[in-house]
């Protein structure tokens, strides 16, 4: 679609005569008829296939024609066409004399023609005017012409439609050849794709308008190159999204278990020494006179059974006092006035003379101790039970009664919820304080990795040499469709072509 424009500039008819040679009375009131048609080697009468246009009376005899695009587009004259411009044309311009006001062909006498010119040739679409002058015996016509495309049409023959836009469907203006020229900040075939903020991460970031950088789930920051830790993470960071890599001094799946419990919580009481012994675990070494997991219990000084040889202990404000049985003396009844003759060994202990009978020693049977075998062995004195287990004497042996969540002879084992392998499809099991958590392999989800989810095996771009990748959803594997000249499961091998 376009317009053939004809600009009449000057018409000379000095003698004011018609083509027949007869003079006009009182002068030649001149108007023009224009016929535009397809190219003819010899321009002949016939249909004006590209269009016609007539002017009003523009002057008498000789006159210059003013530019007048305001008055209905009289000069230049417009001959619009709704087809691809062929690049060639034929043009007929007739000058007529109008005796009256009616300019219709049927209202004019046949001899009212002043002059007729016909030209043909090639004409490319363009802004530049071609100037021409045609002279006959009595008249001269100077004019110029050109072909331009209608609004929104472009190209050598005005066949390319292009309408500038700045909306959801595109952001562009049109180049002279009809190609799109994207507005700043936009790209793509139809300029629909915004150009993101410079440096915005290609995979992790995207944008909906120019110079923006929005992050895909799991990423953050101006350029979307920093990950977001897991939702449940407490004292950790990440190097990939939803990770939880613990800060120093923290442990556990969500970094919520204090490895530095002693410093952060000071659990040991009464001046005891605290030692970190694992995740949220610690040991208190009590000062003399104290006991309990946190050394919170004060011992009676008699609790340590300081009196020997069957002496009985009495608590006093400033300590304790031993009441010794007959034959013993000393702060702890440790000195004896007895010999083996006095049968000093209790509980079946056997007596051995020492220092020529001035002293003796008792050899105690199992489960008894003391210089006179007077004490039953307390196998719990070394506090062998770990993790707050309670020690119980059971005749010749001892046993530990464990707190919930612990097992083993000494309560040293944490009862694992993971022992029964609850995670399906190769999921990794993690013990939590109040349960367990499964970390699922790719392609599985759910609390126990029981739900199969489709994974895009093509996401890692496994195919080489511009091969097309297809995901086999039944096996979560990929298949590479190789271009001509390549083979292999990943199209990695070139074929020696003839």
């Amino acid at each position: 679609s376009g317009v053939f424009q004809l600009q009449l500039q000057e018409f000379i008819n000095e003698r004011g005569v018609l083509a027949s040679g007869r003079p006009c009375e009182p002068g030649c009131r001149t108007f023009f008829r224009v016929c535009l048609k397809h190219f003819q080697a010899v321009v002949s009468p016939g249909p004006c296939t590209f269009g016609t246009v007539s002017t009003p009376v523009l002057g008498t005899n000789s006159f210059a024609v003013r530019d007048d695009s305001s008055g209905g587009g009289r000069n230049p004259l417009q001959l619009p066409f709704n087809f691809t411009w062929p690049g060639t044309f034929s043009l007929i311009i007739e000058a007529w004399h109008a005796p009256g006001d009616d300019l219709r062909p049927e209202a004019l006498p046949p001899d009212a023609l002043i002059s007729k010119i016909a030209i043909q040739g090639s004409l490319a679409v363009g802004q530049n005017w071609l100037l021409d002058e045609q002279t006959s015996t009595l008249t001269r016509l100077r004019y110029s012409y050109r072909v331009i495309c209608s609004d929104n049409y472009y190209g050598d023959n005005c066949s390319r439609l292009c309408k500038k836009r700045n909306d959801h469907f595109g952001h562009y203006v049109c180049q002279p050849d009809g190609n799109l020229s994207c507005l700043p900040g936009w790209t793509g075939e139809y300029c629909q794709q915004p150009i993101c903020l410079s440096g915005c991460h290609e995979q992790n970031g995207y944008c909906s308008k120019p110079a923006e950088c929005l992050c895909r789930p799991g990423w953050q920051g101006r350029l979307c190159n920093e990950c977001i830790p897991h939702n449940g993470c407490r004292h950790g960071t990440c190097s990939t999204p939803w990770q939880c890599t613990c800060d120093e001094g923290w442990g556990g799946l969500f970094c919520d278990q204090d490895l530095n419990y002693c410093t952060h919580h000071s659990p040991c009481k009464n001046g005891a020494t605290c030692s970190n012994s694992g995740q949220r675990s610690y040991t208190c070494t009590c000062r003399p006179g104290y006991t309990g997991v946190d050394c919170e219990l004060e011992l009676s000084e008699c609790d340590s059974n300081p009196c020997r040889n069957g002496g009985s202990c009495k608590d006093q404000e400033d300590g304790y006092h031993c009441l010794c049985p007959p034959g013993y003396y000393g702060l702890h009844c440790e000195h004896s006035t007895l010999s083996c003759a006095d049968s000093p060994c209790f509980n079946g202990g056997s007596c051995r003379e020492r220092n020529q009978g001035a002293n003796y020693a008792c050899e105690c049977p199992p489960n008894f101790t003391g210089s006179n075998c007077e004490k039953k062995v307390d196998r719990c004195t070394s506090n062998p039970c770990a993790n707050g287990g309670q020690c119980l004497n059971r005749g010749p042996s001892r046993m530990c009664r464990c707190r919930p969540g612990f097992t083993g002879t000494y309560c040293e084992l944490h009862v694992s919820d993971c022992a029964r392998n609850p995670c399906a499809h190769g999921g990794t099991c993690h013990d939590l304080e109040n349960g367990l958590m499964c970390t699922c392999p790719a392609g599985f989800s759910g609390r126990r990795c029981e739900v199969r989810t489709s994974i895009d095996a093509c996401a890692s771009s496994p195919c080489f040499n511009r091969a097309t990748c297809y995901t086999d959803l039944s096996t979560d594997t990929f298949v590479c469709n190789c271009p001509y000249g390549f083979v292999g499961s990943r199209c990695e091998f070139p074929v020696g072509l003839p």
Partner: antibody, heavy 118, light 107 residues
């Protein structure tokens, strides 16, 4: 235990300003992106603004852009929302939450009421 | 912005019953959907993230499913403490958007 405690709400006249604070504890504040979410009977739950943990990048919903400013002080474990040129449609309960615009909001504060009325 | 539509807006159920709440997104949001529980006068609490992952400390009677544009929250064997309003939220596209909520009451 993770705790987020908002403060600074109240009654304010249209076109005036208000600054909300949110004190965080129980997690390493500087490691996590934070957000403000508001709730009103008329509009329900609406995300308001987000700030990243890494470089302090901020994002806002269109209706508050240019009027609200989200910021954080990692040394004080505190998140802020400066609200200027307040409008009646900003009336809501404002919650401080741990999360970004592209992640779930894992932990929420108890909320603070902001009423904009003449 | 992506529109999140929840249905029903409210429902009554008896103790021990199974309850289903639906959430529809106006565009594909893949599995980037969360569910929250809000009790009267309290802040919302994260129940489920990434469509079907239970948040820490959430009872196993809650479960989530769906993908693309259709999602649902299921509560097996309803307990009295489950009386609350439930919200879905998408975090696939900027800005994040919430559903209008489903109020769950006891019959």
């Amino acid at each position: 235990e993770v705790q987020l405690v908002e403060s600074g709400g109240g009654l304010v006249q249209p076109a005036n300003s208000l600054k909300l604070s949110c004190a965080a504890s129980g997690f390493t504040f500087s490691n996590f992106p934070m957000a403000w979410v508001r709730q009103s009977p008329k509009k329900g739950l609406e995300w308001v603004a987000t700030i990243s943990s890494s470089d302090g990048t901020t994002y806002y919903r269109d209706s508050v852009k240019g009027r609200f400013t989200i910021s954080r002080d990692n040394a004080k474990n505190t998140l802020y929302l400066q609200m200027d040129s307040l409008r009646s449609e900003d009336t809501a309960t404002y919650y401080c939450a741990r999360g970004y615009y592209n992640s779930p909001f894992a932990y929420w504060g108890q909320g603070v009421l902001v009423t904009v009325s003449s | 912005d992506i529109r999140m539509t929840q249905s029903p807006a409210s429902l009554s159920a008896s103790l021990g019953e199974t309850v289903n709440i639906e959430c529809r997104a106006s565009e594909d949001i893949y599995s980037n959907l969360a569910w929250y529980q809000q009790k009267p006068g309290k802040a919302p609490q994260l129940l489920i993230y990434d469509t079907n992952n239970l948040a820490d400390g959430v009872p196993s009677r809650f479960s989530g499913s769906g993908s693309g544009t259709q999602f649902s929250l299921k509560i097996n064997s309803l307990q009295s403490e489950d009386v609350a309003t439930y919200y879905c939220q998408q975090y696939n596209n900027y800005p994040p958007t919430f559903g209008g909520g489903t109020k769950l009451e006891l019959k």
